[in-house]
Interface confidence: medium
């Protein structure tokens, strides 16, 4: 299932994803003055089995004579539901990226490729936000997004990060971090991401619920 | 009537944090009414429009649990309330609670 | 009065097909996956169908969902006695920003 939005905007702050679940889109998209071409994929495919996940369909981009007029491809799944394009700041590498099951690494760039990905996620996707140059961040929690469904519905869990004016870049996890910082950061927010983005649940799981209750009447 | 009433949902077999909970409410002899979810995760709550300002939904995950808490009752809020989980994934709620009956009477 | 219509009441004999409909609107049906949910006498209500027409491992194939435009059907084929239920359509409102559910079909086995 696709997720219906992009990841929440932070004021400041850029995101990107560190592995991309299988069934992930992103289009080929050429730079200005390059198109498709004609006979090449639309978009890339994340897909795999068990133990191997790759990009399947490969972006190609031909100089073209007049102006770019490649189509933005928003796929439609079965749903027909309206998807918005995620868009991605030139690609960012991240250093040793964890090798996830069902999960792509980040396609590596083509030849006169737009500066900006176009990503369509699907749910269970998880993003990781960093503030911009230039900008501290403060964390209240997580810096992250995740993508989930509710009865069809998707929607992206809110970041807990604030980007203040200060001079300091935040890391994604698993970046480096600057040789002189002025305020010692815990180790846990520069090591190498976890495993948490495999949001795949047991089905056999015995699950359990009490109910019990309290009540408080007016005085 | 008037009081307020907390009732609370302890789960076990799974990642609370994982599934969203959602809270139904069922008239005797009627049918289901949503009335809304949390997601435990972040704590962000949807109420439905019937039961906004009148509900409340919290998750804690420190012992993996959720509570609705009702207040203002009345009388056609005898029901039994049922928390049901969600797989955020796949969508539709697939584990019930075994429901909690509360009678509202003066 | 439920968001989602269904008819009250259903009946069938052992081994016949029926099929319970629920209607919507383009805020809800239209526009979002249906669920169903059957509610057997004295219990919690199980899921049955998600994504239209999908079944949640456990749930027998004689059960089928279907959708076309803004209604939504639930199929029981080879109808047993087991099956005397409360069944249930529910989906997301757009328009609501919640689920809703429809009003409740109750199966009689005759």
């Known amino acids: 299932e696709l997720c219906d939005d992009d990841p929440p905007e932070i004021p400041h702050a850029t995101f990107k994803a560190m592995a991309y679940k299988e069934g992930t889109m992103l289009n080929c998209e050429c730079k200005r003055g390059f198109r498709r071409i004609k006979s090449g994929s639309l978009y890339m495919l994340c897909t795999g089995n068990s133990s191997h996940s790759s990009w399947d369909n490969q972006c190609q981009c031909t100089s073209s004579a007049t102006r770019n007029t490649t189509k933005q491809v928003t796929p439609q799944p079965e749903e027909q539901k309206e998807r918005k394009t995620t868009e991605m700041q030139s690609p960012m590498q991240p250093v040793d990226q964890a090798s996830l099951p069902g999960h792509c690494r980040e396609p590596p760039p083509w030849e006169n490729e737009a500066t900006e990905r176009i990503y369509h996620f699907v749910v269970g996707q998880m993003v990781y936000y960093q503030c911009v140059q230039g900008y501290r961040a403060l964390h209240r929690g997580p810096a992250e997004s995740v993508c989930k469904m509710t009865h069809g519905k998707t929607r992206w869990t809110q970041p807990q990060l604030i980007c203040t004016g200060e001079m300091e870049t935040s890391q994604f996890p698993g970046e480096e971090k600057p040789q002189a910082s002025p305020e010692g950061r815990p180790e846990s927010e520069t090591s190498c991401l976890v495993t948490t983005t495999d949001f795949q649940i047991q089905t056999e799981m015995a699950a359990t619920m009490e109910t019990s209750i309290f009540t408080t009447e007016y005085q | 009537p008037g009081a307020t009433v907390k009732i609370s949902c302890k789960v076990s077999g799974y990642t609370f944090t994982d599934y969203y909970m959602h809270w139904v409410q069922q008239a005797p002899g009627k049918g289901l009414e949503w009335m809304g979810l949390?997601?435990?995760?972040?704590?962000?709550?949807i109420y439905a429009e019937k039961f906004q300002g009148r509900v409340t939904i919290t998750a804690d995950t420190s012992t993996d649990t959720a509570y609705m808490e009702l207040s203002s009752l009345r009388s056609e809020d005898t029901a039994v309330y049922y928390c049901?989980?969600?797989?955020?994934?796949?969508?539709?709620?697939?584990?019930w609670g075994q429901g909690t009956l509360v009678t509202v009477s003066s | 009065q439920p968001v989602l219509t269904q008819s009250p009441s259903a009946s069938g004999t052992p081994g016949q097909r029926v099929t319970i409909s629920c209607s919507g609107s383009s805020s809800n049906i239209g526009s979002n996956y249906v669920y169903w949910y059957q509610q057997l006498p004295g219990t919690a209500p199980k899921l049955l169908i998600y994504s239209n027409n999908q079944r949640p491992s456990g749930v027998p194939d004689r059960f089928s969902g279907s959708k076309s435009g803004t209604s939504a059907s639930l199929a029981i084929s080879g109808l047993q006695s087991e099956d005397e239920a409360d069944y249930y359509c529910a989906a997301w409102d757009d328009s609501l920003n919640g689920v809703v559910f429809g009003g409740g079909t109750k199966l009689t086995v005759l």
């Open positions: 049901a989980t969600e797989d955020t994934a796949m969508g539709g709620i697939d584990y």
């Open positions: 949390v997601d435990p995760e972040d704590g962000e709550t």
